[in-house]
């Protein structure tokens, strides 16, 4: 009856800071409503990164001003971070919820530590 | 901190109708699922009702659903209930609870008594 | 639905003693939504363990959690006087979410 979130362990970002990972969730009903939510864990501390609701067959679409964006196909939301720095690195969580129709499901995957290295500059050059 | 505060109980006839309000403070109101619990006097803790996000999807409990409607007001960071056609067994002190991130509830507010008596 | 069970209704012991509280749901659960709440005569339930173990910030550790699929126990290691209160367990992964029907722990 839970719903099961699977998401990778370990994703590294990119030098221009984005990070992609894919969000893979086992629907107990047939939900025409989705609501995915990318949050970050540090020092146990939880903040949402962000969030987006769609409808199956449909195109994800996060806020303008957010860092994320995805896609998504069937049961699988592929999730892009951008504008990561080092200090960035943490814990983040894929969760899922099945908000129509009734009943409503929640799933929290367990996951994805991102690792971001800020780049070297570049030595000046004569 | 992290605050949520009710008003609006009271004694009211069977039959009769009654808005239930609660105030957030301390958080951004709107990234939060709010809920509605009630307890009997001497009874357990039942789940009333649950509102998400933006106010477009909401969930009951089947002993209220067709006369009790939850809403919320993003701006006012506030969470209603209205409960119209009161029966008896309706009576108890009302609770609002955040769902936290994980959906556990977190924290509650102090819980407003509704009497439902002729 | 998923129903909750608890057992037993009433536990009654001494200050100092170990506490042990059982939830069962009528389906398998996942530990990933299982909480458990106190609550104290007079005032609004308090959250103390989420996700079948962890606990909530502020709790005591001598509060802790355990179990998976249906079976769920909230264990309080050594009781102290202000431990005496009702506990419930809670199911939040689907609705309705529902509530176990609770557990007294009195002073014997």
């Known amino acids: 009856k839970a719903m099961h979130v699977a998401q990778p362990a370990v994703v590294l970002a990119n030098s221009r800071g984005t990070a992609s990972f894919v969000c893979e969730y086992a629907s107990p009903g047939k939900a025409t409503e989705v609501r995915v939510t990318v949050l970050r864990q540090a020092d146990s501390q939880v903040t949402e990164v962000c969030a987006a609701t769609y409808m199956m067959g449909n195109e994800l679409t996060f806020l303008d001003d957010s860092i994320c964006t995805g896609t998504s196909s069937g049961n699988q939301v592929n999730l892009t971070i951008q504008g990561l720095r080092a200090m960035d690195t943490g814990l983040y969580i894929c969760k899922v919820e099945l908000m129509y129709p009734p009943p409503y499901y929640m799933g929290i995957g367990n996951g994805t530590q991102i690792y971001v290295i800020d780049p070297e500059p570049c030595p000046d050059s004569d | 901190q992290v605050q949520l505060v009710e008003s609006g109980g009271g004694v009211v006839q069977p039959g009769r109708s009654l808005r239930l309000s609660c105030v957030a403070s301390?958080?951004?109101?709107?990234?939060?699922?709010m809920n509605w619990v009630r307890q009997a006097p001497g009874k357990g803790l039942e789940w009333v009702a649950v509102i998400w996000y933006g106010g477009r999807n909401k969930f009951y409990a089947d002993s209220v659903k067709g006369r009790f409607t939850i809403s919320r007001d993003n701006s006012k960071n506030t969470l209603y209930l209205e409960m119209n056609s009161l029966r008896a067994e309706d009576t108890a002190v009302y609770y609002c609870?955040?769902?936290?991130?994980?959906?556990?509830?977190?924290?509650w507010g102090q819980g407003t008594l509704v009497t439902v008596s002729s | 639905e998923i129903v909750l069970t608890q057992s037993p209704g009433t536990l009654s012991l001494s200050p100092g003693e170990r506490a042990t509280l059982s939830c069962r749901a009528s389906?398998?659960?996942?530990?990933?939504?299982l909480a458990w709440y106190q609550q104290k005569p007079g005032q609004a339930p308090r959250l103390l363990i989420h996700?079948?173990?962890s606990r909530a910030t502020g709790i005591p550790d001598r509060f802790s959690g355990s179990g998976s699929g249906p079976d769920f126990t909230l264990t309080i290691s050594r009781l102290e006087p202000e431990d005496f209160a009702v506990y419930y367990c809670?199911?939040?992964?689907?609705?309705?979410?529902?509530f176990g029907p609770g557990t007294k722990v009195d002073i014997k």
């Open positions: 996700g079948a173990f």
């Open positions: 301390g958080f951004t109101f709107n990234n939060y699922g």
């Open positions: 609870a955040r769902a936290d991130w994980g959906g556990w509830f977190d924290p």
């Open positions: 809670q199911q939040y992964g689907t609705s309705p979410f529902t």
């Open positions: 389906q398998s659960v996942s530990s990933t939504y």
